[in-house]
Interface confidence: low
């Protein structure tokens, strides 16, 4: 799975969308989980309504909400009052029995503000960085890792936007 990057501003809300094949995942509940380490488990944050037909109803766990458009095939997660510690790697999952299929891997980046105060020379554009070769950026521009910085998750150094 490619990793999709979503960037949000601290204190504001961030919406994450996970498209899927509505026929293939017909009748399945969905979940949003946080990846604990590169090879660690994905810890459940919130899941859709116990009754699949009511999946359109928004369910909250703390500041995180989930809602599922089962006909259109789009799972939407809302992170309200985004905080720096919300940054990290997450997954949208489709549940069947005790199993879970990954719909999308998501990297959440929390920006103190939409632009960094570093030089514009730190910017990179998709396709110009090997460090992000398995990630594409939604509505944002990020920068590659600094030398020596750990590559997991492939997070940018905070803030470039548009």
């Amino acid at each position: 799975h490619n990793t999709t990057v979503f960037q949000g501003v601290a204190g504001q809300s961030l919406q994450v969308s996970c498209p899927y094949d509505s026929m293939k995942h017909w009748g399945r509940r969905k979940a949003w989980c946080r990846q604990l380490g590169e090879k660690g488990p994905c810890q459940r944050v919130v899941s859709t309504h116990n009754l699949w037909l009511l999946s359109f109803l928004r369910r909250w766990n703390g500041s995180t909400a989930i809602t599922d458009d089962t006909l259109g095939g789009t799972l939407t997660i809302t992170l309200r009052n985004l905080q720096p510690h919300d940054a990290g790697l997450y997954q949208c999952q489709s549940l069947h029995g005790s199993e879970a299929d990954t719909l999308r891997k998501v990297l959440v980046e929390v920006l103190a503000d939409p632009l960094d105060h570093r030089d514009a020379g730190d910017l990179w554009f998709p396709g110009e960085s090997e460090s992000f070769e398995d990630a594409h950026v939604e509505h944002s521009i990020s920068r590659s890792l600094l030398e020596g910085e750990i590559p997991f998750p492939p997070t940018s150094h905070h803030h470039h936007h548009h």
Epitope: V108, A112, D113
Partner: antibody
């Protein structure tokens, strides 16, 4: 060059209000949060809150809710902080600071003295 | 709120000496998602606003001399000045940059003999 120019010192009476300003230059004002920090004489720093000039969104330290109100004027690239119902406890230097990875840019500070 | 504790309020050293000051947070500042510690160090000289020295616990701000080094993870952090210069006379503050409300330590005043 990024600069934050704060308004001059204020001498105010207890119970009154004061509104200070922070004029930003050298960058796109609407692209960065502006934070406000209090420093009482000889004391540490206290984070008051921030405003996102692009949409006026704010976040406050619970301690300063009802005391401080943050606003901006986008056309003049100026952030404002109003303090109300002033007491001697509010006597301090107030800084505006532009955020990023930490607060890399600070205003010179506005000294507020509350005295009868 | 996260409480930041700088247990040493003042340190007196001779120019050229190495000095280390500590900062403890009441909860971890480590983001498990990106393995960064949201801890910032500032230097404040008399009559001036604070100056950013270190962000993410160990990343030196542009233009800051390399004699300043930040270390630590989780709840325990240090700022080391490898060879103190006369111009380093200042108060040093650590700050929780992890969650709102941002909070600062009480500061460590560095004095030169």
């Amino acid at each position: 060059e990024v600069q934050l120019q704060e308004s001059g010192p204020e001498l105010v009476k207890p119970g009154a209000s004061v509104k200070m300003s922070c004029k930003a230059s050298g960058y796109t004002f609407t692209d960065y949060n502006m934070h406000w920090v209090k420093q009482s004489h000889g004391k540490s720093l206290e984070w008051i809150g921030y405003i996102y000039p692009n949409n006026g969104g704010t976040g406050y330290n619970q301690k300063f809710k009802g005391k401080a109100t943050l606003t901006v004027n986008k056309s003049s690239s100026t952030a404002y902080m109003e303090l109300r119902s002033l007491t001697s406890e509010d006597s301090a230097v107030y800084y505006c600071a532009r955020s990023g990875r930490g607060f890399a840019y600070w205003g010179q500070g506005t000294l507020v003295t509350v005295s009868a | 709120d996260i409480v930041m504790t700088q247990s040493t309020s003042s340190l007196t050293v001779t120019a050229g000496e190495k000095v280390t000051m500590s900062c403890k947070s009441s909860q971890s500042l480590l983001n498990s998602g990106n393995q960064k510690n949201y801890l910032t160090w500032y230097q404040q000289k008399p009559g001036q606003p604070p100056k950013l020295l270190i962000y993410w616990a160990s990343s030196r701000e542009s233009g800051v001399p390399d004699r300043f080094t930040g270390r630590g993870s989780g709840t325990d952090f240090t700022l080391t000045i490898s060879s103190v210069q006369a111009e380093d006379l200042a108060v040093y503050y650590c700050q929780n940059d992890y969650s709102y409300p941002f909070t600062f330590g009480s500061g460590t005043k560095l004095e030169i003999k």
